[in-house]
Interface confidence: low
């Protein structure tokens, strides 16, 4: 089955700058600004565009050692990024993949809204564990806040 979870979160960072840092340079930023959450990001294949495979490794103590993400779409004009978790982590007997869509929308106050859709593709009639959805949401939120803090402290970066 397919289980869809949608969420919105806001940021004080302008959309274009946030897309540049959080989406386009997340591979470099995440281990730097949130080493407690992501220990490394390794490019397995591709140049960052659709089809690119990345291996995201987690610190010791996490329930999962790594996940592999596949980039599905990068829209620099509309600040959209689609990717799928295809291996490692929760992917296995009951879960086939997780398709994620992130869209960053500018707000009148100069900040932005992140619209996030997570589609869990389960095998057979298996359901999604609430704990997994929560964990994924918390991971995203913490990475976002870490990047946000970095950008606020480094006003010259990613402009």
């Amino acid at each position: 089955g397919v289980f869809n979870y949608e969420t919105e979160t806001t940021s004080v960072i302008p959309a274009a700058r946030l897309f540049k840092a959080f989406i386009l340079d997340g591979d470099n930023l995440f281990p730097k600004v949130a080493p407690q959450a992501i220990s490394s990001v390794e490019n397995i294949e591709g140049n960052g565009g659709p089809g690119t495979i990345k291996k995201i490794s987690f610190p010791e103590g996490f329930p999962f050692k790594y996940v592999k993400d596949r980039v599905d779409e990068v829209d620099h004009t509309n600040f959209k990024y689609n990717y799928s978790v295809i291996e490692g982590g929760p992917i296995g007997d009951t879960l086939e993949k997780i398709s994620n869509e992130i869209k960053i929308v500018a707000t009148p106050d100069g900040g932005s809204i992140l619209k996030i859709s997570n589609k869990y593709h389960t095998k057979g009639d298996h359901e999604v564990k609430a704990e997994q959805v929560k964990a994924s949401k918390e991971m995203g939120e913490t990475l976002l806040r870490a990047v946000e803090s970095y950008l606020l402290a480094h006003s010259d970066a990613y402009n």
Epitope: A135, E138, T142, S149
Partner: antibody
Framework: EVQLVESGGGLVQPGGSLRLSCTAS????????THWVRQAPGKGLEWVSH????????TYADTVKGRFFTSRDNVKNTLFLQMDSLRAEDTAVYFC????????????????????WGQGTTVTVSS | DIVMTQSPLSLPVTPGEPASISCRSS???????????LDWYLQKPGRSPQLLIY???HRASGVPDRFSGDGSGTDFTLKISRVEAEDVGVYYC????????FGGGTKVEIK
């Protein structure tokens, strides 16, 4: 440098109140659960309370429930412990400590221990 | 509530020799995700506590590899492969599976 600094301790009469503060620096304060732990003179460590990174979830030890209140100001990177109806047995050194990385709830998948501690502040409850 | 019991209360040690401290919980600390929610802390004389081991066996950042955590469920052990003079202090285990609670502590001192 990652650090926590407690303040606000002092001498207070039984039944009185005191508010402790713990100021964080060197890390993204709002991403971490924070704890209060105390140590009575010559005794062991006693966990007092914790609060989630976003301040929405708090838990207290039975010994302080209903009398102590933990809160945080993520803009000022400060943790608070409001202590009311103080008793002689609350006399202790109070430490704040950084807990798990997380944002909204007590999520067990991301637990790294209490890895940063403050120097402690002394609370004496006596008439 | 989960009760944590440590032994021994006091442990005289010889530098260079191994040492071990036991910690027992009144309920299993093994979570369904496979991790044991038990930490070990050391409080050196006149100092704040410091984290040694989390999740039963994971050494915290900067902790020497002579320290190791072992055990699962209700029985846990902190081992020091070769005690050094700087290791003196009170060692505490702590469970975080439910509302956190510490063991009573084990005082390690040089013979």
């Amino acid at each position: 440098e990652v650090q926590l600094v407690e303040s606000g301790g002092g001498l207070v009469q039984p039944g009185g109140s005191l508010r402790l503060s713990c100021t964080a620096s060197g890390f993204t304060f709002s991403s971490y659960m924070t704890h209060w732990v105390r140590q009575a003179p010559g005794k062991g460590l006693e966990w007092v309370s914790h609060i989630s990174g976003d301040g929405t979830n708090t838990t207290y030890a039975d010994t302080v429930k209903g009398r102590f209140f933990t809160s945080r100001d993520n803009v000022k990177n400060t943790l608070f412990l409001q202590m009311d109806s103080l008793r002689a047995e609350d006399t202790a050194v109070y430490f704040c400590a950084r807990g798990s990385w997380y944002t909204t709830g007590w999520h067990r998948n991301y637990y790294f221990g209490m890895d940063v501690w403050g120097q402690g502040t002394t609370v004496t409850v006596s008439s | 509530d989960i009760v944590m019991t440590q032994s021994p209360l006091s442990l005289p040690v010889t530098p260079g020799e191994p040492a071990s401290i036991s910690c027992r919980s009144s309920q299993s600390l093994l979570h369904s995700n496979g991790y044991n929610y038990l930490d070990w802390y050391l409080q050196k004389p006149g100092r704040s506590p410091q984290l040694l081991i989390y999740l039963g066996s994971h050494r915290a950042s900067g902790v020497p590899d002579r320290f190791s955590g072992d055990g699962s469920g209700t029985d846990f052990t902190l081992k020091i492969s070769r005690v050094e003079a700087e290791d003196v202090g009170v060692y505490y285990c702590m469970q975080v599976l439910q509302t956190p609670s510490f063991g009573g502590g084990t005082k390690v001192e040089i013979k």
